[in-house]
């Protein structure tokens, strides 16, 4: 038997992926566990193998179909179970009735690139990945810039309250190395959360022209 507190958290990426994390204090170390998804109104069901991400937590991705296919809607309810092998049987360790559009977390933005860089400013663009057509252009973004000598946690957050897949960073220091990240969130869903941060994009501002006031 497994004692201790258990936490089972899942998010829908709005298209064809449900990502889950299961945490269990005092969990069995060498037991095979999986997440099973059983929708209430679809003909498919899906399973993924839970893999350790730390000493007491496991994660897996339920792939429901092609990345850009719309596999679930607001009326779907998916029963999600954590099943762990006990001898020849499977034991239910956690269960939840999952409402996908109340528990959204989009994929991190991709394809970050520097469009134009100057001494004091830099224009950066990105793309969103696997976001439902239901949202149309109604998404919000947060961005942050890592300056020399600072940490990501210290970086001020810039908020974009519309689907704007670019930003012009101003008041930068010439000839300086920076890093930039962005994340995205839809408006819908009581338990919806920000996407993971994008991979950081490194860029360097241009040096100030010699003999000029900067």
């Amino acid at each position: 038997a497994v004692n201790g507190t258990s936490q089972f958290t899942c998010f829908y990426n709005s298209r064809a992926n449900i990502s889950c994390v299961w945490s269990q204090d005092g969990a069995l170390q060498d037991t095979s566990c999986q997440v099973h998804a059983w929708p209430d109104r679809r003909r498919w069901n899906q399973t993924c193998e839970l893999l350790p991400v730390s000493q007491a937590s496991w994660a897996c991705n339920l792939i429901l179909g092609a990345p850009d296919s719309q596999k679930l809607t607001t009326v779907d309810i998916v029963t999600l179970r954590v099943l762990c092998r006990e001898g020849v049987r499977w034991r239910v360790m956690a269960i939840q009735d999952f409402k996908p559009f109340e528990n959204l977390r989009l994929m991190a933005p991709i394809s970050l690139q520097v469009v134009h860089v100057e001494t004091h400013r830099c224009n950066i663009s990105w793309e969103i990945s696997q976001a439902s057509h239901y949202f149309e252009r109604h998404l919000e973004f947060e961005a942050r810039t890592l300056s020399p000598g600072h940490t990501w946690e210290e970086a001020p957050l810039l908020t974009l309250k519309q689907k704007q897949e670019w930003i012009c960073l101003e008041t930068l220091t010439p000839d300086t190395q920076y890093e930039f990240q962005v994340r995205v969130k839809p408006l819908q869903g009581e338990f919806t959360t920000w996407s993971p941060w994008s991979q950081p994009l490194a860029f360097r501002t241009k040096p100030a022209a010699l003999g000029k006031d900067t």
Partner: nanobody
Framework: EVQLVESGGGLVQTGGSLRLSCAVS????????MGWYRQVPGKQRELVAD???????KYADSVKGRFSILRDSVKNTVYLQMSSLKPEDTGIYYC?????????????WGQGTQVTVSS
């Protein structure tokens, strides 16, 4: 302003058929589910049938095999083909549409159409 306009209700004898239709119009929206609910006096509105994106239909047990739902996503219209009607199918039939407007999802209802099955 979103509008749901129902039609097709009426009086029919036991064993007869009716076809209800409901058209959604108005401001810019994306529909992900459309369906029909029934209300009889003194009772809660209950699901008769609905259809979500991906062709996933859901029916009340009492109508399975007798009613069929059809959704035309291009015309934003849903139909309920009712056959082998029984007196217990009598009630007000309401159309419901789940609509995405400006990035948020809400449910919208029609005014209802009366279906009466006489014995």
């Amino acid at each position: 302003e979103v509008q749901l306009v129902e039609s097709g209700g009426g009086l029919v004898q036991t064993g007869g058929s009716l076809r209800l239709s409901c058209a959604v119009s108005g401001s810019r929206f994306i529909s992900d589910v459309m369906g029909w609910y029934r209300q009889v006096p003194g009772k809660q509105r209950e699901l008769v049938a609905d259809m979500a994106d991906g062709g996933s239909a859901k029916y009340a047990d009492s109508v399975k095999g007798r009613f069929s739902i059809l959704r035309d996503s291009v015309k934003n219209t849903v139909y309920l083909q009712m056959s082998s009607l029984k007196p217990e199918d009598t009630g007000i039939y309401y159309c419901k549409a789940g609509l995405w407007i400006a990035g948020r999802h809400s449910d919208y209802w029609g005014q209802g159409t009366q279906v009466t099955v006489s014995s």
